[in-house]
Interface confidence: medium
């Protein structure tokens, strides 16, 4: 089955390459013959994934306000067979709050 | 904040070995990948390869395989890069670069960078 | 020689915009995100441009990257004498299975 906690990602990060966290099968055993696959909106562009252990990175800058979550896809391929290991699963990540919308008194 | 502080100077005589240090801080260190990066003198930049610094995975430019290991000690965030055989070509500077995974990351923190100077 | 091509000089005068391209193929520009780096002189590079087209926090406006199909490139605008540095531009070639650095270009800033 899939492995993972939930994502996080800080709104306004202040670096260009957030590592989120890890995404695997409990089958792979990391002798990298499994493919990691990320699909959905902000995949590829706004999220990527490292095809061989499964980290996914933010490489771009969130705003909570526009989108407090993302509702992504995984995959997770044999490579020698081309068939999938587990089921796409669907996984969410949140944009953690910065408060940068803080009450006025 | 990210930094990646390296070994210092080195010369050596053809034929030698030398191996570089980079020691990592301000981040988990397992997360990302460091890449390594030449540039000799007055000359551009050229990657070397890449090592995955939680299963030690690596992955080499053509030009180097052979020639160069890229290893890491997860316990003190460094990683090292031993380069053996030196000729007078492999004089220059060597930079460790954090990122490099396929496709899209990019080197986002460079090291300052190490002179290494082959001379007979 | 560069797998990505890169002029080797490019001068401007403080406030004109200046473009430098960089040149591929399929196998990298065509297929991958274009990074860019400056380096000052005496200094290790910095990233200027990641994935095309985004600026690390820090990095000016004046400074942006686009590509299109096989070529990228970067323009400055509003130049300034501390912009005077060499330039590459780096990309993973899907047949190397590597990193791939443009020759690097030499910015001067006149006057």
């Known amino acids: 089955g899939w492995v993972w906690n939930q994502f996080f990602v800080p709104e306004e990060m202040n670096t260009t390459s957030h590592h989120i966290g890890q995404l695997r099968s409990d089958l792979d055993n990391g002798n990298n013959s499994f493919q990691y696959k990320l699909l959905g909106a902000g995949a590829g562009s706004t999220f990527i994934i490292d095809e061989r252990t499964g980290d996914i990175y933010a490489i771009q800058k969130l705003d909570r306000e526009e989108r407090s979550l993302y509702i992504l896809r995984a995959q997770v391929i044999d490579i020698a067979t081309g068939r999938a290991v587990e089921p796409e699963s669907e996984f969410v990540i949140k944009v953690s709050d910065i408060n940068d919308n803080e009450p006025k008194f | 904040q990210v930094q990646l502080v390296q070994s210092g100077a080195e010369v050596k005589k053809p034929g030698a070995s030398v191996k570089v240090s980079c020691k990592a801080s301000?981040?988990?260190?397992?997360?990302?990948?460091m890449s390594w990066v030449r540039q000799a003198p007055g000359q551009g930049l050229e990657w070397m390869g890449i090592i995955h610094p939680s299963g030690g995975d690596t992955t080499y430019a053509q030009k180097f395989q052979g020639r160069v290991t890229m290893t890491r000690d997860t316990s003190t965030s460094t990683v090292y890069m031993e380069l053996s055989s030196l000729r007078s070509e492999d004089t220059a500077v060597y930079y460790c670069?954090?990122?490099?995974?396929?496709?899209?990351?990019?080197?986002?923190?460079w090291g300052q960078g190490t002179l290494v100077t082959v001379s007979s | 020689q560069s797998v990505l091509t890169q002029p080797p000089s490019a001068s401007g005068t403080p406030g004109q915009r200046v473009t430098i391209s960089c040149s591929g193929s399929r196998s990298n520009i065509g297929s991958n995100f274009v990074n860019w780096y400056q380096q000052l002189p005496g200094t290790a590079p910095k990233l200027l441009i990641y994935?095309?087209?985004q600026r690390p926090s820090g990095v000016p406006d004046r400074f942006s990257g686009s590509k299109s199909g096989t070529s990228a490139s970067l323009a400055i605008s509003g130049l300034q004498s501390e912009d005077e540095a060499d330039y590459y531009c780096a990309v993973w070639d899907d047949s190397l299975n590597g990193w791939v650095f443009g020759g690097g270009t030499k910015l001067t800033v006149l006057g």
């Open positions: 301000g981040y988990t260190f397992t997360s990302y990948y």
């Open positions: 670069a954090r990122g490099g995974i396929k496709l899209w990351l990019h080197f986002d923190y």
């Open positions: 994935t095309n087209n």
